[in-house]
């Protein structure tokens, strides 16, 4: 499974699209910034088998896809950019799913790192809660956009580690 090559390119495209999606100046939102507790340790690929790492990546992108597929998200972002971004994420999910199937067949035990998956889910719950509390304001979405760019960047680091494991 040549995940890292295809996935890294897709991730870079997703980051560029997300960068282009900004609608208001982030400098008007400094007071709205929030520590969502990005579980950075879950992006340390050295502690995972390849299958586990792919599962964490999948969860990360699935949750990002879900977040940007809501009605509130549709109202917040320019439609064509949002569609391109979602399509990019969807394509990455398909690639990852194909990789998981392939990798599981090669490993003796398809280990799932439940703690890591849970940490990622809780992280996105905190993001969703923040948006709800801020009533999905433009600044709240701007803060979340920056946070998702940060998390996608971390997942890029995980992909680099995966590439070395190939």
């Amino acid at each position: 499974c040549d995940l890292p090559q295809t996935h890294s390119l897709g991730n870079r495209r997703a980051l560029i699209l997300l960068a282009q999606m900004g609608r208001i100046s982030p400098f008007s939102c400094l007071k709205d910034r929030h520590d969502f507790g990005l579980p950075q340790e879950e992006f340390d690929g050295n502690q995972f088998q390849k299958t586990q790492a792919i599962s964490v990546l999948h969860e990360m992108i699935q949750q990002t896809f879900n977040l940007f597929s809501t009605e509130d998200s549709s109202a917040a972002w320019e439609q064509s950019l949002l569609e391109k971004f979602s399509t990019e994420l969807y394509q990455q999910l398909n690639n990852l799913e194909a990789c998981v199937i392939q990798e599981v067949g090669m490993e003796e035990t398809p280990l799932m790192n439940e703690d890591s998956i849970l940490a990622v889910r809780k992280y996105f719950q905190r993001i969703t809660l923040y948006l709800t509390e801020k009533k999905y304001s433009p600044c709240a979405w701007e803060v979340v956009r920056a946070e998702i760019m940060r998390s996608l960047s971390f997942s890029t680091n995980l992909q680099k580690i995966l590439r070395r494991k190939d």
């Epitope: 282009q20 900004g22 100046s25 007071k31 910034r33 929030h34 920056a146 946070e147």
Partner: antibody
Framework: QVQLQESGTVLARPGASVKMSCKAS????????MHWVKQRPGQGLEWIGV????????TYNQKFKDKAKLTAVTSANTAYMELSSLTNEDSAVYFC?????????????WGQGTTVTVSS | DIVLTQSPASLAVSLGQRATISCRAS??????????MHWYQQKPGQTPKLLIY???NLESGVPARFSGSGSGTDFTLNIHPVEEEDAATYYC?????????FGSGTKLEIK
Amino acid sequence: QVQLQESGTVLARPGASVKMSCKASGYSFTTYWMHWVKQRPGQGLEWIGVIYPGNGDTTYNQKFKDKAKLTAVTSANTAYMELSSLTNEDSAVYFCTRNYKYDYYTMDYWGQGTTVTVSS
Amino acid sequence: DIVLTQSPASLAVSLGQRATISCRASKSVSTSGHSYMHWYQQKPGQTPKLLIYLASNLESGVPARFSGSGSGTDFTLNIHPVEEEDAATYYCQHSGELPFTFGSGTKLEIK
């Protein structure tokens, strides 16, 4: 690798204007904010402002609002800063620096600096 | 504007000892879990180099002898053990609100 190449030393007369450049390479120029920072000889650092090359959005330190104008040409991967109505106080080294860590607003890569000397 | 007061203005520390630099903000630069204070090192004739971001996070590639701490208005940069190559001027910078400002700098000399 990431590089920010700034224009060379500038000598200007009081009252004149100067425009300096900062050519970026090794990264996606349009997706990172670019800060500009002033450093007078033997003194500290002052934040002038920031530009987003992707759409030209700018934010200034009010102190420099009427002094500096930030622009960018994406086709040339180059950011510019124009300083107007120069006085001796504007004699300094000016750095362009790439924004880092998204909304943490730190600065990772720095240009080598453009030295501006204002003298009659 | 938030004023950052660094102290001392200069200090001389023996090789292998601890250097402690303080940065006090005129107003809190912490909000919702993050402290928006960062530290830079500038050697003579060179550009500043990011050492620490968000008060305590070590930038990639920076030696572990550098550490940062603090929240609200009071922040500290520690270097231990000090090495010859650490001779430089150190600046704090906040990004809590506009305009971002820097401290006046602390010059570290190695004895």
